[in-house]
């Protein structure tokens, strides 16, 4: 008799299969131990890391990972060819760009090679797991006496990303933030020339090419005002 455990984590295809883990119910067999959950992130659609918590195993175990793409030309089962290690135990797998198909359902299977029946399968939508690189080349332009425009670049297709700009002055205790769409441009209409401003930006693969929840790292900050703006009042791009 097999017990089927459903372990949805919000990334499964709700119109198709949930995540399935089948475990024999042999009394106190090692097979009944659940396998750790696999977490995958696609970094700027350049490579993908799928990792698990290897320390959750009762004893050090080199778990193996297989993957395939459901209902597609890429449905052949593939072995992980580049394992990641934590204290000499497998703790993840890195897939290269050519192995990543964002818009096909990615199926990942973790297995205990010493107990082949002990396996867990998850289905992931990779377009919801993309994390872009942090924005680069932040620049500030003075549009008028009191208006600043912040621009930046991303190393990805512009329309696939949305952005979050944060700024504050040296007098502020917290950041003010503003969402920005794919146009990657932000204007601050009222700037106090007596204050020093700091700006930073992060980006997310949402909503036009995917529905990712995770943001990139913050960009390097850029500063404007008081002791810096005198050097060039029309263009300033100093990274801290």
């Amino acid at each position: 008799l097999n017990t089927t455990i459903l372990t949805p984590n919000g990334n499964e295809d709700t119109t198709a299969d949930f995540f399935l883990t089948t475990m024999p119910t042999d009394s106190l067999s090692v097979s009944t131990l659940p396998l750790p959950e696999v977490q995958c992130f696609v970094f700027n659609v350049e490579y993908m890391n799928c990792t698990w918590n290897s320390s959750s195993e009762p004893q050090p175990t080199n778990l193996t990972l297989h993957y395939w793409y459901k209902n597609s030309d890429n449905d052949k089962v593939q072995k992980c060819s580049h394992y990641l290690f934590s204290e000499e135990i497998t703790s993840g797998c890195q897939l290269q760009k050519k192995e990543i198909h964002l818009y096909q359902t990615f199926v990942v299977q973790l297995q205990d090679p010493r107990e082949p029946r002990r396996q867990a399968t998850q289905m992931l939508k990779l377009q919801n797991l993309v994390i872009p690189w942090a924005p680069e080349n932040l620049t500030l332009h003075k549009l008028s006496e009191s208006q600043l425009e912040l621009n930046w670049n991303n190393r990805f297709l512009n329309h696939c990303l949305e952005h979050l700009v944060q700024y504050r002055t040296d007098w502020d205790h917290s950041w003010t933030e503003q969402s920005v769409d794919y146009r990657h441009k932000f204007s601050l209409p009222s700037v106090d020339g007596q204050k020093r401003y700091t700006f930073r930006v992060r980006s997310r693969f949402n909503p036009l090419c995917g529905s990712a929840q995770h943001w990139s790292e913050w960009s390097h900050p850029i500063h404007w005002g008081s002791n810096t703006s005198k050097e060039n009042p029309f263009l300033f791009a100093l990274e801290a």
Epitope: V45, L102, Y103, Q104, Q127, L157, N158, C160, L208, C209
Partner: nanobody, 125 residues
């Protein structure tokens, strides 16, 4: 910085031909799906043709047999050869870039202003 620059538009008589070009920079061209959209005054943005990174092509029904999409990875350029043009093809044509696999497995309506300035094609009868 990601940039798409269209060229090759112009005015032509019905039955004539034009070849549109789009030069891309700032992203990995040969790992992207490319496409052409068009927008006539008062109309929505319409997907005309796409070419995927593996060479698969798509054409909207109204241009099948008349338009041909192709790409030159060495030049980071995608082309749209348009033959037997009619007045109904009059529009601004926009070049588009998408993540690999977007067109064949995902899709979704696009606004033409996501990309470049476009190139005007005018066909008179």
């Amino acid at each position: 910085q990601v940039q798409l620059q269209e060229s090759g538009g112009g005015s032509v008589q019905a039955g004539g031909s034009l070849r549109l070009s789009c030069t891309a920079s700032g992203f990995t061209f040969d790992d992207s799906d490319m496409g052409w959209y068009r927008q006539a005054p008062g109309n929505e943005c319409e997907l005309v043709s796409t070419i995927s990174s593996d060479g698969n092509t798509y054409y909207t029904d109204s241009v099948k047999g008349r338009f041909t999409i192709s790409q030159d990875n060495a030049k980071n350029t995608v082309y749209l050869q348009m033959n037997s043009l009619g007045p109904e093809d009059t529009a601004v044509y926009y070049c588009a870039a998408e993540p690999r696999g977007y067109y064949s497995n995902y899709g979704g309506r696009r606004e033409c202003n996501y990309w470049g300035q476009g190139t005007q094609v005018t066909v008179s009868s």
